[in-house]
Amino acid sequence: GITNINCSGHIWVEPATIFKMGMNISIYCQAAIKNCQPRKLHFYKNGIKERFQITRINKTTARLWYKNFLEPHASMYCTAECPKHFQETLICGKDISSGYPPDIPDEVTCVIYEYSGNMTCTWNAGKLTYIDTKYVVHVKSLETEEEQQYLTSSYINISTDSLQGGKKYLVWVQAANALGMEESKQLQIHLDDIVIPSAAVISRAETINATVPKTIIYWDSQTTIEKVSCEMRYKATTNQTWNVKEFDTNFTYVQQSEFYLEPNIKYVFQVRCQETGKRYWQPWSSLFFHKTPETVPQVTSKAFQHDTWNSGLTVASISTGHLTSDNRGDIG
């Protein structure tokens, strides 16, 4: 097999084994098999024999030409038909890759999730490159001018313990692969300005059948940050549009937020917070569902009113790990 090839010749690609997607490429195969003047040379792509665009260059060499090659990866090998051999003889094999140079990384963002002990930096990498692309994150202290570099394939977590050069830094990202290199703009950060409070979580909901039914949402966070601003958004599950309520919050106790909602409708709630006045928000919390109860027809009977409206009857929902929001990454 081709797992560990002992080549009886040579296979090479022009312009290179990694090339820009959509290029015309040539694959050359040169046989060097003892006691064999090849009758024919064959090329295979992903195990399939190629039948067209093959040119015999001389007694031992052939060329396979591809126009507008669009496959991200292919495994190529070539064989020879030797006069005294029943089977084709393997010459050599090579994996080829096509893709794109990286785009300029943009939207570089660095945040510190409270209690994580890390600064997490992310960026928009741009279009898919299809080939192995590495990123170098540069972190330069504005106080000491010391620069640290971190190699990664996607985002990076940098321990806050390693950020010894004060509070102010420049961060930028270089992207590189076999086809090119690009560099982002520099982002200036202050460590105190990029902290995102510990996640806010909705724990339960209840609807109280008072004179006007009222839904109370209970929610909390383990944050130690004193000044926190939060948003709660909610909508009927059948609706597209969210309603948003804003809160200035002190998390020394569980928060209770009141909503007057339509009866007999399933609602979904989410919450997110930020340190007041700072730039970055938490991602929206997991989706929390609560169905409001049906209203009881209002009648004049006092007894009936007493039995229903004033009974303190509640309908409750409790959080048990709901579906994740499609907006988890929304921290801008």
């Epitope: 797992t3 399939i48 024999k49 039948r51 067209f52 089977q87 393997l90």
Partner: nanobody, 119 residues
Framework: EVQLVESGGGLVQPGGSLTLSCVAS????????MGWFRQAPGKEREFVAA????????VYAASVKGRFTISRDNAKNTVYLGMKSLKPEDTAVYVC????????????WGQGTQVTVSS
């Protein structure tokens, strides 16, 4: 027509092993080669390995060489993909394919079997 049905996928820990099977039925004599491809979420379908009826019997993608082994039982019309030293990046839907030199490609595809490598 050739029908292909895969089995053997599942959840495995990094470093673990798994063997996938693909049973072919129908006009199996019309296939020169049977192969495996894989597709991870958000990525292109990627060639993994192929086994030819005759001539050079096997070929592997660089990313799996030395870890995966493709074999074929002609009596059972089955092709196998033995996978060892599995890595999280091997997580994908693995799809069996049958092809012919006459058409210059893979003409028949199975539905796929999910392989998840995670601790």
């Amino acid at each position: 027509e050739v029908q292909l049905v895969e089995s053997g996928g599942g959840l495995v820990q990094p470093g673990g092993s798994l063997t996938l099977s693909c049973v072919a039925s129908g006009r199996t004599f019309s296939t020169d080669v049977m192969g495996w491809f894989r597709q991870a979420p958000g990525k292109e379908r990627e060639f993994v390995a192929a086994h030819r009826r005759n001539g050079i019997s096997t070929v592997y993608a660089a990313s799996v060489k030395g870890r995966f082994t493709i074999s074929r039982d002609n009596a059972k019309n089955t092709v196998y993909l033995g996978m060892k030293s599995l890595k999280p990046e091997d997580t994908a839907v693995y799809v069996c394919a049958a092809g012919s030199d006459a058409s210059g490609g893979y003409d028949y595809w199975g539905q796929g079997t999910q392989v998840t490598v995670s601790s």
